[in-house]
């Protein structure tokens, strides 16, 4: 694999964001040792770009079998195509492996868009630019899929990193994460920074491009600038979190916070938009729609149906409102604020038609199970996912892509509230999500 | 407990329409295909087609492909078959099932009896 | 379309025997992905079918373990090693390999 390609990103991307200095946080941790630092091994082991998932190179099996697996935060299934498919390249062969035991029990999993079955059994797994370390971890074989692999995202497999209650058939399978935690000395954590490219690439650039970094086991002090303000895991299913306020441009949307989280909040690599409930939908785009009103988009547009499109390097950035979640912070009353630009929920297409225009889909859009903080919002930030402290974090990212007016930021604290009720109570039930 | 419960028997008159329905419990017909099939008097099972209620997509069998129209409401956890310009070959048992990725029916209706007279 | 040809479209038993009941495809049903997607049902009088067997030799959850399928490409076989009561009723292989899903004619499994 290609490591360490990176494509020269337009406008004064990568490096530290110009402009605001963040205020640093005054009681942060002293260091612990493992759990920060560096961990050159590990930087820009992610490819891909957002509407298509970011994947991390695994090998499964004795001798080992290299996959490309799509890193998913929205679900708990380490799962791998594992016979012919037409948008796969390779394939796990459970046959070739002297090491693969079978469990003798199927699985199904429906996610937001795709589904598939498969056949649960155990082997052994690493990460080539991971954890020096190999587990037995469970691995559902995937012998049959409909609209779940993607034809030319190179990934042949997903990498469930949430929390055993969502695993399917039931959460007596164990997660790939809570196995590398239990069989070495793997500290519970784990951290991402998804870059999104900022325009288009075609199937040669992505091959070449660095799409990122998941740091297993600890945090990499490249990866950000600024303090990492954290907010509670609420429940661990999902990564849970609570949204306390939202504004566009500095307005706050003015609803009762419960509709943020309607039925529930969610951080999720492998959704591609910010997705929001229908009310906080509908409110967010009246509010962008008027920011931006300077110029008219089709209702398409907003609907992410169309693309809208603009001579190459004359994207009216400036015209778009930036978008702040208030988060529940870790002290009573305290909140912290995450902003992201138009360069993160603007999502850059490839446009066949006029291919040197630079076109772009509206990457926010309605969701029927609470808000989903997808890739466009992660490719602003450093996120992590501390499972040892029930927590997750954010800063900006040192990869995401910005221009010289304004860029992401990580804010706070503010005084909040009644946080708590912030919170939906949710009859339960389980649930799987995946790129949308 | 898993249930496909369809809705009632019909006795239509020819070149009418009649829309059937089939409402799911124990589960989300969204996490699922439903899939709905014909049985007539001593003819054996036919597929008519299925249904992603996900994302409205649909399949048809050729033969019904201008007969009938499959379509699904996850609010209501219900799927429907409309039949249209009956004649009397319509009149049969239809009947809906699940299925997951793999087509195999592994929960059905009680089916519904469609009479087509005059 | 995929023609199912059961044999014989009428078997006379008496319980404990043993059944046996043939399927046949006019071609082979090996999907691309290398499995073959040939199932069976029971229908019994005044009820809708239910599955006993999913990709040829996989027995639906709940169903007693008399019932086998075995088979590949394009010949397949149920059988029921010894029968009971509550085994009588009509017996259907059907493919989904190929598009549209097809079935049998069914074989009804009676007693002498």
């Known amino acids: 694999t290609q490591h360490g390609i990176r494509l020269p990103l337009r406008s004064g991307l990568g490096g530290a964001p110009l402009g605001l200095r963040l205020p640093r946080e005054t009681d942060e941790e002293p260091e612990e040792p493992g759990r920060r630092g560096s961990f050159v091994e590990m930087v820009d082991n992610l490819r891909g770009k957002s509407g298509q998932g970011y994947y991390v190179e695994m090998t499964v099996g004795s001798p080992p079998q290299t996959l490309n697996i799509l890193v998913d935060t929205g679900s708990s299934n380490f799962a791998v195509g594992a016979a012919p498919h037409p948008f796969l390249h390779r394939y796990y062969q459970r046959q070739l492996s002297s090491t693969y035991r079978d469990l003798r029990k199927g699985v199904y999993v429906p996610y937001t868009q795709g589904k598939w079955e498969g056949e649960l059994g155990t082997d052994l797994v690493s990460i080539p630019h991971g954890p020096n370390v190999t587990v037995r971890a469970n691995i559902a074989a995937i012998t049959e899929s409909d609209k779940f692999f993607i034809n030319g995202s190179n990934w042949e497999g997903i990498l469930g990193l949430a929390y055993a209650e969502i695993a399917r058939p039931d959460d007596s399978l164990e997660p790939f994460f809570d196995s590398l935690v239990k069989q070495t000395h793997v500290p519970n954590l784990f951290s991402l920074q998804l870059c999104g490219a900022g325009f288009p690439l075609n199937q040669s650039e992505v091959l070449a491009s660095v799409g990122g970094s998941m740091i297993i086991g600890g945090i990499d002090h490249s990866l950000y600038t600024g303090s990492l303000w954290y907010t509670p895991i609420r429940r661990e299913w999902y990564y849970e979190v609570i949204i306390v306020r939202v504004e566009i441009n500095g307005q706050d949307l003015k609803m009762d916070c419960k509709e943020y989280n309607y039925d529930k909040s969610i951080v999720d690599s492998g959704t591609t938009n910010l997705r929001l409930p229908k009310k906080v939908f509908e409110a967010a785009v009246k509010s962008i729609k008027a920011a931006s009103s300077t110029e008219k988009f089709p209702d398409g547009f907003w609907l992410g149906e169309q693309l809208v499109c603009w001579q190459a390097g004359t994207t009216p950035w400036n015209i778009f409102p930036v978008i702040s979640l208030y988060l529940m912070g870790e002290v009573t009353n305290q909140s912290f604020r995450i902003t992201i630009l138009p360069q993160q929920y603007l999502r850059p297409v490839e446009d066949v038609a006029t291919s040197q225009d630079d076109c772009y889909k509206f990457a926010i859009s309605q969701s029927s199970t609470g808000t989903v903080m997808g890739a466009v919002i992660m490719e602003g930030f450093y996120v992590v996912f501390d499972r040892a402290r029930k927590r997750i974090g954010f800063a900006v990212s040192a990869c995401h892509v910005h221009d010289e007016f304004r860029t992401a930021a990580v804010e706070g604290p503010f005084v909040t509230l009644d946080m708590e009720d912030c919170g939906y109570n949710i009859p339960q039930t389980d649930e799987s999500t995946l790129m949308t | 407990e898993i249930q496909l419960q369809q809705s009632g028997a019909e006795l239509v008159m020819p070149g009418s329409s009649v829309k059937l329905s089939c409402t799911a419990s124990?589960?989300?017909?969204?996490?699922?295909?439903i899939h709905w099939l014909k049985q007539r008097t001593e003819q054996g099972l036919e597929w008519i087609g299925k249904i992603d209620p996900a994302d409205g997509e649909t399949k048809y069998a050729p033969k019904f492909q201008d007969k009938a129209t499959i379509t699904a409401d996850t609010s209501s956890n219900t799927a429907y078959l409309q039949l249209s310009r009956l004649t009397s070959e319509d009149t049969a048992v239809y009947y809906c099932?699940?299925?997951?990725?793999?087509?195999?029916?592994?929960?059905w209706g009680q089916g519904t009896t469609v009479t087509v007279s005059s | 379309d995929i023609q199912m040809t059961q044999t014989p479209l009428s078997l006379p038993v008496s319980l404990g025997d043993q059944a046996s009941i043939s399927c046949r495809s006019s071609q082979s049903l090996v999907h691309s992905n290398g499995n073959t997607y040939l199932h069976w049902y029971l229908q019994k009088p005044g009820q809708s079918p239910k599955l006993l067997i999913y990709k040829v030799s996989n027995r639906f959850s709940g169903v007693p373990d008399r019932f086998s399928g075995s088979g590949s490409g394009t010949d397949f076989t149920l059988k029921i090693s010894r029968v009971e009561a509550e085994d009588l009723g009509v017996y259907f292989c059907?493919?989904?390999?190929?598009?549209?899903?097809?079935f049998g004619a069914g074989t009804k499994l009676e007693l002498k």
């Open positions: 099932a699940r299925t997951m990725v793999v087509e195999r029916f592994d929960y």
């Open positions: 059907s493919q989904s390999t190929h598009v549209p899903l097809t």
């Open positions: 124990g589960f989300s017909i969204a996490d699922y295909y």
